[in-house]
């Protein structure tokens, strides 16, 4: 899973240049719009994969809340700040001096302000729900089965611990999958839940992040598991500060 | 009734390559299901080697990950298995499985790889 | 990656006893729904044989004397009364994290 050394590529992110300047003409690769040296062995981290993408932007998304403290990607796609680490910075501002604050999935979660916005640490989302619907079926789905094969996806393409899918619901033909990460959970090398839940995103919509992977092909006992839509909710150690207004 | 059935050489030189073929009958491995190969030193326990899936992904034991490759040719409704570097240690018998939704449902019979000069 | 430990490691019975073995997890290998623990019977020159998945669920033409329970980290199998087919080694196998481990057996001898 590191750098392809055979023909320099990076197999968890092909929104990368990659080249043979590495120590001892190892296979260095790093990502679009950053130029940002990345980790091959692992997934790259949704602020340097949104950075990239803005070379070539599609439309925004927009989601549907569930509740008073989650948050939704409704600002969709922005050029944003990373940090050394890849990490969103706290603050992120546009070309016209507009700020705000998002979390560690780099979703809004203050309203938008002047350059004087204080954002004072970056917020973890802790909690992640994907909301799938899946196509129908000749039946519904053994619930089990998808439990098992859900986990295995995460595990094996995401290389997310099978500790973090705190739960996978199911009633036909809605499939609930929840991701828990506090910070205190999180050890070096552990893949973060807004990451994996970004790659899967970009999976169920066919734009598959991986070098020469074909896309998503999710079975469980033989039977194709098709996804119509998607919608995930972030949920943050700390709730969310938006004014009243923005709530009417 | 699924049935899955491995060959390949008795006998291969250390610091060689183990090559063995699983040859599946009764379900189409690109249909669905992960296709497994697992091996038992003699008189020894289990250890699992790795997978290839319905789509052909790969999934490898850490421990051998650095000499293992398995591949499938669907045509034939085989999936193979590649060993390199191998030693003494790797004398086992191997078998090839299918994994269900993570535990093994059906087997082949086995074939014993002794490794030797 | 995640050690089973299967105890005993050897057992002598006899025809009509009840038998349990046990099987313990390094770490959780439960989910909200699932179990990922498997057990396998093996006799001499052959392959496993699955006999129960995902901790108690009985695989198909499997008989009844063969029961499986336990979640998170123990397990337990039970053969409720001995039949002289049943003289085997037996393994668990986890599979909530890869890679793959089973436990080193257990060899259910004729006392």
């Known amino acids: 899973h590191t750098a392809a050394q055979d023909n320099c590529t990076c197999p968890t992110n092909k929104m990368t240049v990659c080249s043979p300047d590495g120590p001892g003409g190892r296979c260095q690769c790093r990502a679009l719009g950053s130029g940002m040296a990345v980790d091959c062995s692992t997934l790259t981290s949704k602020c340097l994969l949104l950075k990239a993408r803005m070379s070539a932007p599609k439309n925004a998304r927009t989601l549907v809340r569930p509740s008073e403290h989650a948050l939704v990607d409704n600002d969709g796609l922005y050029d944003p700040d990373c940090d050394p680490e890849g990490r969103f910075k706290a603050r992120q501002c546009n070309q016209t001096s507009v700020c705000w604050c998002v979390n560690s999935v780099g979703v809004r979660r203050t309203d938008k302000g002047d350059l004087s916005l204080r954002c004072d640490e970056l917020v973890r989302t802790h909690h992640i729900l994907i909301d799938l619907r899946h196509r129908p079926t000749a039946g519904a789905f053994n619930h089990s089965d998808l439990d098992a094969e859900l986990r295995r996806l995460f595990r094996e393409r995401y290389r997310l611990h099978p500790k973090f899918v705190a739960a996978v619901h199911y009633e036909q033909p809605t499939i609930q999958i929840e991701l828990r990460q506090n910070t205190s959970q999180k050890a070096a090398g552990d893949v973060d839940i807004g990451d994996a839940a970004y790659y899967f995103e970009r999976d169920i919509k066919g734009e598959s992040l991986f070098q020469g992977r074909g896309g998503l092909d999710l079975r469980v006992r033989g039977e194709p598991l098709q996804v119509e839509r998607t919608l995930i909710y972030y949920l943050d150690e700390i709730p969310p500060k938006f004014s009243m207004k923005r709530l009417t | 009734q699924v049935q899955l059935q491995e060959s390949g050489p008795g006998l291969v030189k250390p610091s060689q390559t183990l090559s063995l073929t699983c040859t599946v009958s009764?379900?189409?491995?690109?249909?669905?299901?992960?296709w497994n190969w697992i091996r038992q030193p003699p008189g020894k326990g289990l250890e699992w080697i790795g997978y290839?899936?319905?789509?052909?992904?790969?999934l490898y034991n850490p421990s051998l990950k650095s000499r293992v490759t398995i591949s499938r040719d669907t045509s034939k409704n085989q999936f193979s298995l590649k060993l390199s570097s191998v030693t003494a240690a790797d004398t086992a018998v191997y078998y090839c499985?299918?994994?269900?939704?993570?535990?093994?449902?059906?087997w082949g019979q086995g074939t014993l790889v002794t490794v030797s000069s | 990656d995640i050690q089973m430990t299967q105890s005993p490691s050897s057992l002598s019975a006899s025809v009509g006893d009840r038998v349990t073995i046990t099987c313990r997890a390094s770490?959780?290998?439960?989910?909200?729904?699932?179990?990922?623990l498997h057990w396998y019977q093996q006799k001499p020159g052959k392959a496993p044989k699955l006999l129960i998945y995902?901790?108690?669920n009985l695989e198909s033409g499997v008989p009844s004397r063969f029961s499986g329970s336990g979640s998170g980290t123990d397990f337990t199998l039970t053969i409720s009364s001995l039949q002289p087919e049943d003289f085997a080694t037996y393994y668990c196998?986890?599979?909530?994290?890869?890679?793959?481990?089973f436990g080193q057996g257990t060899k259910l001898e004729i006392k």
């Open positions: 499985a299918r994994d269900t939704t993570a535990y093994f449902d059906y």
């Open positions: 009764g379900y189409s491995i690109s249909s669905g299901y992960y």
């Open positions: 290839i899936s319905y789509s052909g992904r790969n």
């Open positions: 770490e959780s290998v439960s989910s909200s729904v699932n179990r990922f």
């Open positions: 995902r901790a108690s």
């Open positions: 196998q986890q599979s909530n994290e890869d890679p793959y481990t």
